[in-house]
């Protein structure tokens, strides 16, 4: 994924502006690209620091521009260096005066170990001086003045890696600024070999590509791409995936491209000459125009791309039949993807012919890490590579690159990934209220750590010390009731926030623990409420035998019906009664009771009672005599509630008889409201009185009632409603 390119625009310096541009194409360097003077190659060059600026036309590129007035200080060797994941890559180049006495045949020369090499300089200026040749700034050879040829050569019959370096030529009276430079690159291995011991065979690197002696990979010349450099780029493009473009009016004219060793420097395809400003002659193409077209079937030769094959033909010389190769294209990849941190499965989809295979599709992270597909499938028209990042994190945000490299060419598509932090509540939920089977919770979803917006919220809960999975409910409001909980159980609660997108579930927030109440004991049995005095009521119940050994007590609640007066009394569990005192006379009270342990029990039904009266009872009302026969009659009445009436007395006697000859009928159930008098005489008049009795005494009747029985043969009158004592 590391594609570093150094463009030396006009290595022969005259009075025109000249520059070095270093481009990191297809990867994002961890550290800035650096451009510096290569003192290893030339120790005694100018010491001035370089003014390195950002190349505004490209995202990851640095530039040094020398104005024409600085021409005298430019001569020398330079490097560009980029670093990614601890690996450094350095590209070297040189600049020299166009007015130098000699000029090199080429700026760099790559040879294989053992090659027979001639390093040549062309004499441009004739001087009556000895010519001298230096290597890396050290003198190695001289030619007497009268023997200096038109082509000055250094001959290396069996080039070795130690022969590599910057060779310079000048007249003895000259200096660095009149020197010509060329750099010899000697591959560590012999031709077509690679490996630490140079005993592996290189793949064919077409179109003047160079086999890297350490890895066996092809370094492709500017204008060609693919594993074997077979595929020509579109016009005026370069780089490992041909996505960099020459912006000049005539494309890549006057651009010298320098690539990592062992490639060195060359013109872009279609150009030649030291300044790369000469077009290829007809029939030639490629970098430095070194490749000759030998197109079959009279196909046309293009100086940039070589043979332009007719449909149905392919290969360098259009020698192979078959579907013409199509440069891969990456499709359906958005420019920007928002991703939630966690697992991420990016997809790279590409077309082309032949269809890309899984090993030809990679994904490059912003730090330069190359990922290979975890899954791969293809249809008739597309290859789909699925990658897996098990844990993508915010630092992984940035420009990622989908890269496809087939025999038909290479393509890369950068896209921006923005990794979001999953939201997590800062606070635990709060428990507002609990019962034995429910809890009311404030989920406290804000504030939260991480990125919004929040799409949904979940309240997670489970019993502590249970191996159960967390249960959850979707929550819309901040207050939520959890139902169907187990009694007397400790629960854990937390909140999970969900943001938009796949895998948007954040980590659950802090945990809150709470315990549900126990199920309450049943109320006391046999409850009975009776008045004891004008200010007391007595509540009694049956003895309580609880099923657990927990401490318990009876809670009695009494409240007045007439007044807003309520009291709760705790009674030890071993008692069976309580006296409710300090009450008001002639007042109705509602009482209920429950048995409590740590948990509260269930309330009993309400019991109602009046305290005893402090006054005489009122006289019974609505007294009616009905259903009169010759020997009986029915008397009915009503009494007022609240006077502690304990009994009703009916007193009757035959009219005219003495007072002491009366009969008293005492009805001790005050709820009875009618009574049938029997054993009366026919056709007799009776005087009837009725009294109410309470704890104070009897009511005072205002008047007596008369009752006359019928003769023996007559039918009775209708009987009134109400309870009747027979």
């Amino acid at each position: 994924a590391m594609d570093l390119i150094l463009i030396n625009s006009l290595p022969l310096v005259s009075d025109a502006e000249t520059s070095l541009t270093c481009i990191a194409s297809g990867w994002r360097p961890h550290e800035p690209i650096t451009i510096g003077r290569d003192f290893e190659a030339l120790m005694n060059q100018h010491q001035d620091p370089l003014e390195v600026t950002q190349d505004v036309t490209r995202e990851w590129a640095k530039k040094v521009v020398w104005k024409r007035e600085k021409a005298s200080k430019i001569n020398g060797a330079y490097f560009c260096e980029g670093r990614v994941r601890g690996e450094a890559i350095r590209i070297r180049t040189m600049k020299m005066r166009q007015q130098a006495s000699f000029l090199p045949a080429t700026l760099t020369m790559t040879v294989d170990k053992g090659d027979n090499v001639n390093i040549s300089f062309k004499k441009v200026l004739i001087k009556e001086e000895d010519a001298v040749i230096y290597k890396n700034g050290s003198f190695i050879h001289s030619v007497p003045r009268h023997e200096v040829p038109d082509i000055l050569e250094v001959h290396l019959p069996h080039a070795q890696p130690q022969d590599a370096g910057v060779y310079s030529a000048r007249y003895i009276g000259g200096n660095l600024f009149t020197s010509a430079f060329t750099r010899l690159i000697v591959r560590r291995c012999e031709a077509q070999k690679w490996g630490p011991e140079c005993n592996h065979l290189c793949t064919a690197c077409m179109n003047n590509g160079v086999c890297h002696e350490d890895t066996g990979e092809c370094i492709c010349p500017p204008g060609f791409m693919g594993r074997t450099c077979e595929k020509a780029c579109e016009l005026h493009t370069f780089g490992r995936t041909c996505k960099e473009r020459c912006s000049g009016q005539e494309g890549c004219k006057s651009y010298v491209f320098c690539l990592p060793d062992p490639y060195g420097c060359s013109c872009a395809t279609g150009w030649k000459g030291l300044q790369c400003n000469e077009a290829c002659h007809p029939g030639f193409y490629g970098p430095d125009c070194k490749l000759r077209c030998s197109c079959n079937n009279g196909e046309m030769c293009d100086r940039f791309q070589g043979c332009l094959c007719s449909p149905g033909w392919q290969g360098l010389q259009c020698e192979r039949e078959g579907i013409p190769r199509m440069t891969p294209k990456i499709v359906d990849l958005p420019d920007h993807i928002e991703v939630n941190s966690g697992k991420f499965n990016p997809i790279c989809k590409a077309s082309g012919w032949p269809l890309p295979t899984n090993e030809e599709m990679t994904l490059v992270k912003p730090d330069g890490t190359v990922l290979h597909p975890k899954d791969f499938n293809h249809t008739d028209h597309f290859s789909v590579a699925i990658f897996t990042i098990h844990r993508i994190l915010p630092p992984d945000s940035g420009v990622w690159v989908c890269s496809v490299n087939t025999v038909a060419g290479m393509v890369e598509k950068p896209f921006n990934i923005s990794v979001k932090v999953l939201p997590k509540p800062l606070n635990a939920p709060n428990v507002i209220d609990t019962g034995h089977n429910f809890a009311v919770i404030n989920i406290s979803s804000e504030p939260y750590f991480g990125d919004g917006p929040i799409k949904s919220k979940k309240l997670l809960y489970k019993p502590v010390n249970h191996y159960e999975a967390w249960q959850h409910i979707q929550v819309t409001n901040e207050i939520v009731t959890l139902n169907y909980l187990e009694p007397r159980t400790e629960y854990e609660l937390c909140v999970q926030l969900v943001r938009r997108g796949e895998g948007g579930e954040g980590h659950p927030g802090p945990v809150r623990r709470f315990t549900t109440a126990s199920i309450g004991l049943p109320p006391p049995r046999g409850l009975n409420l009776l008045p004891k005095s004008q200010t007391t009521l007595n509540l009694t119940w049956q003895p309580i035998f609880p099923s657990s050994e927990d401490d318990f007590y009876v809670e009695v609640e009494r409240r007045s019906v007439q007044k807003s007066d309520q009291q709760n009394i705790k009674v030890p569990g071993n008692l069976t009664s309580v006296l409710l005192n300090n009450l008001h006379p002639r007042e109705q009270y509602v009482v209920r009771a429950r048995v409590n342990t740590k948990a509260q029990g269930e309330w009993s039904e309400d019991l109602t009672a009046w305290t005893l009266s402090d006054i005489l009872p009122p006289q019974p009302e609505n007294i009616k005599i009905s259903n009169i026969t010759h020997s009986s009659a029915v008397i009915s009445w009503t009494i007022l509630d609240g006077y502690s009436i304990s009994s009703i007395t009916i007193r009757y006697k035959v009219q005219g008889k003495n007072e002491d000859q009366h009969v008293d009928v005492k009805i001790k159930n005050a709820t009875i409201t009618q009574y049938q008098l029997k054993g009366l005489e026919p056709e007799t008049a009776y005087q009837v009185d009725i009294f109410a009795e309470n704890n104070i005494g009897s009511s005072n009747p205002a008047f007596s009632h008369e009752l006359v029985t019928l003769p023996e043969s007559q039918a009775p009158a209708d009987l009134g409603g109400g309870k009747m004592l027979l």
Epitope: Q192, G195, P196, E197, N199, H200, L201, C202, T203, A204, M206, D214, T215, G216, E217, R227, T228, E230, G315, P354, T357, E359, V407
Partner: antibody, heavy 117, light 113 residues
Framework: QVQLVQSGGGVVQPGRSLRLSCAAS????????MHWVRQAPGKGLEWVAV????????YYADSVKGRFTISRDNSKNMLQLQMNRLRSEDTAVYYC??????????WGQGTVITVSS | DIQMTQSPDSLAVSLGERATINCKSS????????????LAWYQQKPGQPPNLLMY???TRESGVPDRFSGSGSGTDFTLTISSLQAEDVAVYYC?????????FGQGTRLEIK
């Protein structure tokens, strides 16, 4: 998809000859070096021979040197292994393979050679 | 020639457990000039050709599950399967390509316990 399809296996008597073929598709065959690797029954993998992309360079394992010849016909996308003076220890499954650097990336399906009298 | 020795010869591991296969070379396969180890790992299932898993000792080949990882440097290398799956039952080979001829380890048979 890159494919290597092998043919030419069989049973042969010791001292006789046999020719194995490997047809490549889905790649520019003429750009790649090609290997032969073999695996004796129940045994591990043993590298046999390699040929450069242009056929100029050929290397052999000591165990087959002088008896086996690796060759290629780039016009037909075809790799061959000519095996002469076969021995019983040459009995194996033979695989052709394309390299990715020094590792072997694409393998043929294998062809069985049995050398037996 | 560089000799490659694998250990153990066979290995039985429970499903979901970690499997570790070792490979030792008779000389270093680390190339100092680029700090790369010239070592590959292969998986071979019965009746099938070997399948490239790793190269440069730790670079996973595309399509290989990430439960496979390679480590080590110089002469000692390890292939690790973090959580064994049923489909991982196979013979595993290491191979050096530091020097020709390329040579393979004798193989490690991995089975389910």
């Amino acid at each position: 998809q890159v494919q290597l399809v092998q043919s030419g296996g069989g049973v042969v008597q010791p001292g006789r000859s046999l020719r194995l073929s490997c047809a490549a598709s889905g790649l520019t065959f003429s750009n790649y070096a090609m290997h032969w690797v073999r695996q004796a029954p129940g045994k591990g993998l043993e590298w046999v021979a390699v040929i450069s992309y242009d056929g100029e360079n050929k290397y052999y394992a000591d165990s087959v040197k002088g008896r086996f010849t690796i060759s290629r016909d780039n016009s037909k996308n075809m790799l061959q292994l000519q095996m002469n003076r076969l021995r019983s220890e040459d009995t194996a499954v033979y695989y052709c393979a394309t390299p990715k650097g020094g590792a072997l990336e694409i393998w043929g399906q294998g062809t069985v050679i049995t050398v037996s009298s | 020639d560089i000799q490659m020795t694998q250990s153990p010869d066979s290995l039985a591991v429970s499903l979901g457990e970690r499997a570790t296969i070792n490979c030792k070379s008779s000389q270093s396969v680390l190339f100092s000039s680029n700090n790369k180890n010239y070592l590959a790992w292969y998986q071979q299932k019965p009746g099938q050709p070997p399948n490239l898993l790793m190269y440069w000792a730790s670079t996973r080949e595309s399509g290989v599950p990430d439960r496979f990882s390679g480590s080590g440097s110089g002469t000692d290398f390890t292939l690790t399967i973090s959580s064994l799956q049923a489909e991982d039952v196979a013979v595993y080979y290491c191979q050096q390509y530091y020097s020709a001829p390329i040579t393979f380890g004798q193989g490690t048979r991995l089975e389910i316990k």
